[in-house]
């Protein structure tokens, strides 16, 4: 969480951003909130990116003002116009690209004063893994697949019964480049699986960590997956 204060002659206002990560090819949100004003026409929102000459987005006098928008963001940004009045200056970013990563500044002017806060935005690819029993294999085998990751993640297997065990000798992980030549499909195979055990396939890079669990018993198979973004801290 980054909280910024204005330092102008006018009073300063509090602006708060949250560091976040964007999944390339999907939409992202750059979060920013501020002390609201009672008049929409008095609010100015400017989004800037370090190293970029033009603006990322500008909203003032109750409407978007994009004459100074940098070319890399054209047709790709929007504020939540109906929420500006309640202090939401968050920016929606269409079709996130790797090059969108960097330091952004959310700069606010209201009748109460000015304020700004920086936001670190990481970009990459992350997806939920799915673990299945591989019935084609000669021995009891599990297959963990996740369709889109970047940068290349690490894959670690764990088991509830054999806690602390190292499965690197009995697993094989491969990375297959997807058609857009950036993201990769992750496939990891775990051999010599025992019944009545819960196995976890953990995929992690510097942006996200995802886990796929599978519980294999004689009567049923239960699966569960979850994904968490790393380093989402507010400013």
């Amino acid at each position: 969480l980054i909280i910024g204060f204005g330092i102008s002659g006018r009073h300063s206002i509090t602006v708060t951003t949250v560091a976040s990560a964007g999944n390339i090819g999907e939409d992202g949100i750059l979060s920013c909130t501020f002390e609201p004003d009672i008049k929409l026409s008095d609010i100015v929102i400017q989004w800037l990116k370090e190293g970029v000459l033009g603006l990322v987005h500008e909203f003032k006098e109750g409407k978007d003002e994009l004459s100074e928008q940098d070319e890399m963001f054209r047709g790709r940004t929007a504020v939540f116009a109906d929420q500006v009045i309640v202090g939401n200056a968050s920016l929606r970013l269409k079709n996130v690209q790797l090059t969108d990563a960097g330091t952004y500044k959310c700069y606010i002017i209201t009748s109460k004063g000015k304020g700004n806060a920086n936001l670190e935005y990481k970009t990459g690819a992350f997806s939920m893994p799915e673990v299945n029993v591989d019935y084609n294999a000669s021995s009891e085998t599990l297959r963990c697949e996740a369709p889109r990751w970047f940068p290349q993640p690490t894959v670690v297997w764990a088991s509830q019964v054999d806690q602390g065990a190292n499965f690197s000798e009995v697993s094989n992980t491969s990375f297959e480049l997807n058609s857009e030549n950036v993201t990769m499909k992750v496939v990891s195979v775990l051999y010599n699986v025992t019944i009545n055990n819960t196995y976890s396939c953990m995929i992690e890079n510097d942006i996200a960590k995802a886990t796929g669990d599978i519980k294999v018993t004689e009567s049923e198979i239960k699966r569960r997956s979850h994904l968490q973004l790393l380093n989402s801290k507010a400013s």
């Epitope: 090819g25 999907e26 939409d27 033009g54 987005h57 409407k63 978007d64 003002e65 994009l66 004459s67 100074e68 928008q69 940098d70 070319e71 054209r74 047709g75 790709r76 940004t77 929007a78 929606r92 269409k94 079709n95």
Partner: antibody
Framework: QVQLQQSGPGLVQPSQSLSITCTVS????????VHWVRQSPGKGLEWLGV???????DYNAAFISRLSISKDNSKSQVFFKMNSLQADDTAIYYC?????????????WGQGTLVTVSA | NIVMTQSPKSMSMSVGERVTLSCKAS??????VSWYQQKPEQSPKLLIY???NRYTGVPDRFTGSGSATDFTLTISSVQAEDVTDYHC?????????FGSGTKLEIK
Amino acid sequence: QVQLQQSGPGLVQPSQSLSITCTVSGFSLTSYGVHWVRQSPGKGLEWLGVIWSGGSTDYNAAFISRLSISKDNSKSQVFFKMNSLQADDTAIYYCARDITTIVEGFAYWGQGTLVTVSA
Amino acid sequence: NIVMTQSPKSMSMSVGERVTLSCKASENVGTYVSWYQQKPEQSPKLLIYGASNRYTGVPDRFTGSGSATDFTLTISSVQAEDVTDYHCGQTYSYPFTFGSGTKLEIK
């Protein structure tokens, strides 16, 4: 309310150029991009290009060599010019504005300019 | 270029029937699909944007759904005034592209 009004010729000689003006009202050209779309007889819609708020353009690669889009913010006018027209360029040409600055759909359309390419 | 394939090319329905129009993208377009209604001699009218958001003033019998590559426009109870052409389009990546349209007719 938002309106886009088109003006331009109906008949163009083969190999000549086409110019259409789209005059907008109800919004500022510094807030939204204006797109150009055409519809050939009995065919689907075809996106040709866009001029953004800042004046930069994106064109459909199939038309990039003979298409030019410009604007005058103070007059709220967008100018479309296509060179070297042939018979298969006969179509209705539309200017359109997106619903949001992020281009999720074209909410506002001009009335269309029917262009016939014929000697 | 992303190809948008609409099906069927035409369909004949009775008033009050439920209609489902399909639009398939040749690659992932997220939710950047819009649906348009176009009556003869008129400009297209936006019905649905962002795959599932009904545009202002559009009757609630029109519903959009789908994401990635498969999209659907549903008319829950077709009315006589709905008999016309429908187009889908994607605005995810350049060049923006449209389907070839579906013509809706009344039996």
